[in-house]
């Protein structure tokens, strides 16, 4: 029950996180004009990964897309790439985790397969979250660097009479959305990985069995089942050899736990 809850919660948290990463990537407010120097401006600038916008106090907003690819800063391209990779990995992770959910029954899929998929999706969520956090952090670092550079060159002109105020940009809402979303995706991924451990069938210490064949006694040592960690080739938990022998554990093992998803 705790495993199902952990897995389900991990899925929901990751889902919210990935939705947040998508939202942050699409948002225009990655950087917003710093109004400290000119709080009464009638024109407010803000920029996203894909376009820059100008909002006038009249309510009129004009946005222009970055129609060049080669002319954009390498850092911006890197941030775009990180966010897209984060979204793609997150989306695949979500798809995998849907099938891995313990509460959803798909054919005769066994726990080991679900554990495998849960771990895979968990790792994907972790990487997705890290990509988003990295992307947002790179952009934030870029902003901080530019902010102090523009502050150093804030005023130029003849004896300070004419002030050419450089537009400084500060953190926009998208950065905070991205950080939170990345964190949620990361947490969701960790929860999925934790749930995976609970889903994986534990190795059973099977008791020794006696196999009687034409008068000879052959003692089979425990380990008739190959213990599955979810990564072994024998994922179906079939006996390596079954010549009609039965362990004491198996006698009353109906219905098997593998019959339930």
């Amino acid at each position: 029950m705790a495993v199902t809850a952990c897995q389900g919660l991990g899925f929901v948290v990751s889902l919210i996180g990935i939705a947040g990463i998508i939202a942050a990537t699409c948002m225009d407010q990655w950087s917003t004009q710093d109004l400290y120097n000119n709080p009464v401006t009638a024109v407010f600038n803000y920029q996203g990964l894909w376009r820059s916008c100008v909002r006038e106090s009249s309510g009129f907003t004009e946005c222009r897309g970055y129609f060049t690819l080669l002319g954009l800063p390498a850092m911006l391209q890197a941030v775009r790439a990180l966010m897209i990779v984060g979204i793609v990995l997150g989306a695949i992770g979500l798809l995998v985790s849907i099938f891995a959910l313990k509460c959803i029954r798909i054919g005769s899929m066994e726990d080991s397969a679900k554990a495998n998929m849960t771990l895979t999706s968990g790792i994907m969520f972790i990487v997705s979250g890290l990509c988003a956090i990295a992307g947002v952090s790179v952009f934030a670092n870029m902003l901080v660097t530019n902010f102090w550079m523009s502050t150093a060159n804030m005023y130029t002109g003849m004896g300070g009479m004419v002030q050419t105020v450089q537009t400084r940009y500060t953190f926009g809402a998208a950065l905070f959305v991205g950080w939170v979303a990345g964190g949620l995706t990361l947490i969701g991924g960790v929860m999925m990985c934790i749930a995976c451990r609970g889903l994986a069938p534990e190795e059973t210490n099977y008791k020794a069995v006696s196999y009687h064949a034409s008068g000879h006694s052959v003692a089979y040592k425990p380990g008739g089942f190959k213990a599955s960690t979810g990564f072994g080739s024998n994922t179906k938990n079939k006996k390596i050899y079954d010549g009609g022998a039965r362990t004491e554990d198996e006698v009353q093992s109906y219905p098997s736990k593998h019959d339930y998803v």
């Epitope: 916008c53 100008v54 450089q166």
Partner: antibody
């Protein structure tokens, strides 16, 4: 066609309040902003404030404490209220239309003369 | 507040002559976000309200004769009348549209000889 017409009291005693109405036609106040500008006799233009299409206002900081701009979209009227009038508030008061900040005040009213005198 | 300084304060020219008047702002009126200059020019004839001539520093308002040209960027702006006509007798104001309050210059009075 686009028209703006100011109407005011003409003469006001010092320390009294002023209310000027700008009645517009040919456009909607839900699409355009309206600015108030005054011009003392023989002097230059002074911007007082604006009410934008959405209802937000901005004022000249020097007059903000005694200035108020409001509007009634259904009546196509914009109101300028100013209190604690002094003799140096004597001026021609204009209302002007503006679509966006970048496009200037494209239509002006003929103005209304205000004299502050006892 | 942004201070708008106009020069000269007045000038007298003959009809047909070219006229140039200057407007300087204490802060840049160029917005980096859209590369627009938030400056307008107005013409005020005696006994009349001001009339918009130029907005965005260089865009001529519809109906304005093409002899009126606005130029400049940042803090330095110019209004040029290529061939002055008798009806151009007026006071010309520049205005900051970038930051509140939307300050006007003191004006340049154009007189015809």
């Amino acid at each position: 066609q686009v028209q703006l017409k100011e109407s005011g009291p003409g003469l006001v005693a010092p320390s009294q309040s002023l209310s000027i109405t700008c009645t517009v036609s040919g456009f909607s106040l839900t699409s355009y902003g309206v600015h108030w500008v005054r011009q003392p006799p023989g002097k230059g233009l002074e911007w007082l404030g604006v009410i934008w299409a959405g209802g937000s206002t901005n004022y000249n900081s020097a007059l903000m404490s005694r200035l108020s701009i409001s509007k009634d979209n259904s009546k196509s009227q914009v109101f300028l209220k100013m209190n604690s009038l002094q003799t140096d508030d004597t001026a021609m008061y204009y209302c002007a239309r503006d679509f966006t900040t970048a496009t200037g005040f494209d239509y002006w009213g003929q103005g209304t003369t205000l004299t502050v005198s006892s | 507040d942004i201070v708008m300084t106009q020069s000269p304060s007045s000038l007298s020219v003959s009809a047909g002559e070219k006229v140039t008047m200057s407007c300087k702002s204490s802060q840049s009126l160029l917005n980096s976000g859209n590369q627009k200059n938030y400056l307008a020019w107005y013409q005020q004839k005696p006994g009349q309200p001001p009339k918009l001539l130029i907005y965005g520093a260089s865009t001529r308002e519809s109906g304005v004769p093409d002899r009126f040209t606005g130029s400049g960027s940042g803090t330095d702006f110019t209004l040029t009348i290529s061939s002055v006509q008798a009806e151009d007798l007026a006071v010309y104001y520049c205005q900051n549209d970038h930051s509140y309050p939307f300050t006007f210059g003191s004006g340049t009075k154009l007189e015809i000889k």
